[in-house]
Interface confidence: low
């Protein structure tokens, strides 16, 4: 049909932190390159109907559906969604194409469905159909990777039974300690499932999909390293595979390695050895101990012995169920306004936890660091000296753990006052919680030293603002003090703060007439 306009339908996917989204539904700012949605003419439909490719959107994602119309003259339009018509404001771009946009902010279930766009141009009328659905991540999984020996080869396969199929990568490092951090230049990544180079210092396998990234480290005993002060411990759940690597370097090949479980040699088929010469002609040997599916009786001390090195052991503990061990009692802290301070939680857990720190309904990323004694620690220092309740939450496949912290900031009270026709109230958020005094200012007491004790009602910690306690004191008005100035003072060990209130006689209370 010659009269049909040339139209283009696009999807603009906005990044999560894109502050430009939604500023104007007519002129959305493009944050990522638009994705063409096709917009083909729908066959066998009454009238001219274009159908865009279906759009799948993650929960909370923000998108813009956009139509570009190459047709002469003006256009008018109307969006219809779930039988409701929505405002539509076309504009023209630099190529003089009509542009119509629909911004969907923070996608939810209620915003899923068919969006119909009716366009009227000088030449013709037509309809464009968009179908928007929520991405079904309902039953996605991301499982921690595990190792298997490759059949008939000295190589490890990394497996992660996840949905959708994850990308698997090996993360290798030949340095010690801190320099093996993810971003370090010493770290090499290989995006493949099979690894043949098994002599490195630090070997991890990671799997990632839409849900994130999970890693498993190849547990290693290095006979050339000084043993840790506490025995290294490895936890596994019944049915999981066990892999321990013993590594030793010697000036020549004249040495051997053996594995023992509780002083009994491992059975044939539960270990394999590899050796190579390093660049300085020393010999590196590695001996793997492995059990394809552990049972309770695989628990015990695994010892790697060498004819040329002191032996070293690791305690392998097989558990029925994962766990998180930590003390969950609440902790209260009191610090000065500029004192450096971090909350910290020390825990032992298997499998590894996912965790968050929360304050005032806002979540903060949670970092965990392994300690030498088998424990891990998570610290939170980003409290910006805001008093209130902080929550640490951790979970793994089998367990959950929550710990509450209260942070109090020592400071002199600040007083806010308000008054009504019948009473005056003062509020303070100082810490320690302040005590109150009320004083009347009069001719007899120009310095406001006359104390008021009648009609005073103190409420300590009467409301929580983001977990922060507020103390208040209320003075009920009596004839004796009407028309006078009164002063409320809050004091604690760090100082005193006062506010003066005029208790007006009957009239347009509490306004003071400005003559």
């Amino acid at each position: 049909n010659q009269d049909l306009p040339v139209i283009k339908c696009v999807l603009i996917n906005h990044k999560n932190n894109d502050s430009s989204v939604g500023k104007s539904s007519s002129y959305p700012m493009v944050s990522e390159s638009p994705e063409d949605l096709g917009c083909a003419l729908r066959p066998q439909s009454s009238g001219t109907v274009y159908e865009a490719a279906a759009v799948e959107v993650d929960v909370s994602a923000s998108i813009t559906l956009q139509v570009l119309v190459d047709a002469p003259g003006n256009i008018s339009c109307l969006w219809v969604f779930k039988h409701s018509s929505l405002n539509c404001q076309p504009h023209f771009d630099l190529q003089n194409r009509g542009v119509v946009s629909m911004v969907i902010l923070k996608m939810t279930e209620t915003q899923a469905g068919e969006y119909l766009l009716f366009i009227q141009s000088e030449a013709t009328n037509y309809t464009i159909l968009f179908t928007v659905s929520i991405r079904n991540t309902l039953l996605y999984t991301l499982r921690r990777p595990y190792f298997r020996k490759m059949e008939n080869q000295d190589a490890l396969v990394c497996i992660s039974e996840s949905v959708p199929e994850p990308i698997v990568e090996w993360v290798l490092c030949d340095s010690q300690g801190e320099s093996c951090k993810e971003e370090s230049p010493a770290v090499v990544k290989k995006e493949e499932k099979v690894l043949h180079e098994l002599f490195g210092t630090d070997i991890r396998c990671c799997a990632r999909n839409e849900l994130g990234r999970e890693c498993t480290r190849l547990f290693t005993i290095d006979l050339n390293q000084t043993p840790q002060t506490t025995l290294p411990q490895l936890f596994l759940k019944v049915g999981e595979p066990l892999w321990i690597r013993c590594k030793a370097v010697h000036v020549n090949h004249g040495f051997g390695l053996t594995w023992e479980l509780e002083n009994k040699a491992l059975e044939e088929g539960n270990y394999f050895e590899m050796s190579t010469y390093s660049t300085n002609r020393t010999m590196i040997r590695i001996l793997f101990a492995f059990v394809s599916s552990v049972a309770r009786n695989d628990t015990g001390y695994y010892t790697c012995s060498s004819s040329k090195h002191p032996s070293q052991s690791a305690l392998v503990t097989i558990v029925e169920k994962g766990f998180i061990n930590a003390t969950n009692s609440s902790e209260d802290y009191e610090i000065d306004q500029y004192e450096e301070f971090c909350f910290s939680v020390r825990f032992k857990a298997y499998p590894q936890i996912r965790c968050t720190w929360t304050f005032s309904r806002k979540s903060f990323p949670c970092e965990q660091k392994g300690l030498d004694n088998g424990y891990s620690i998570s610290k939170f220092c980003n409290h910006k000296h805001q008093p209130g309740e902080y929550i640490f939450h951790a979970e793994n496949d089998d367990a959950q753990f929550t710990k509450m912290f209260t942070l109090n900031i020592r400071r002199k009270p600040q007083v806010l006052a308000e008054a009504s026709a019948s009473q005056a109230s003062c509020f303070s958020d100082g810490y320690p919680l302040p005590s109150w005094t009320w004083k009347k200012c009069s001719d007899k007491s120009p310095n406001c030293t006359e104390e008021i004790t009648e009609g005073v009602w103190n409420r300590k910690a009467n409301r929580k603002v983001f977990g922060q306690w507020v103390s208040s004191s209320t003075l009920n008005m009596s004839e004796a003090i009407k028309g006078f100035l009164v002063k409320c003072c809050a004091y604690n060990s760090l100082g005193t703060s006062c506010e003066t209130i005029l208790l007006n006689s009957p009239g347009p209370f509490p306004f003071i007439q400005d003559n």
Partner: nanobody
């Protein structure tokens, strides 16, 4: 902790129907998204259908759309899968799955939390 127990599997002729049930123990059944997966001999476990905690939203694999219906009865702590127009390729062990303990329909956390033991469905003449 939620325990899941499937029932209703068996031998059925092509074109026939079958209803699978999954009984869940635990008071929190109604707060879980639930689903059915299946695993044919020698194949990977695959997604079949899912339903949100309230039953208001359902999802289906393309291969079963229009033939299978997932539903739930929160008062009975039971999940169902009504299977019509069964084909030989539907032969598999069917597993019931409980998602994350969440009242949202779709979630981006790793959510298959609990699995049933499975029930065998054989479609053959």
């Amino acid at each position: 902790e939620v325990q899941l127990l499937e029932s209703g599997g068996g031998l059925v002729q092509p074109g026939g129907s079958l209803t699978l049930s999954c009984a869940a123990s635990g008071r929190t059944f109604s707060s879980y998204a639930m689903g059915w997966f299946r695993q044919a001999p020698g194949k990977e476990r695959e997604f079949v259908a899912a339903i949100s905690w309230s039953g208001s939203s359902t999802y289906y694999a393309d291969s079963v759309k229009g033939r299978f219906t997932i539903s739930r009865d929160n008062s009975k702590n039971t999940l169902y899968l009504q299977m019509n127009s069964l084909r030989a390729e539907d032969t598999a062990v069917y597993y019931c799955a409980a998602g994350g303990s969440t009242r949202v329909v779709v979630t981006t956390t790793p959510v298959v939390k609990y699995w049933g033991q499975g029930t065998l469905v054989t479609v053959s003449s």
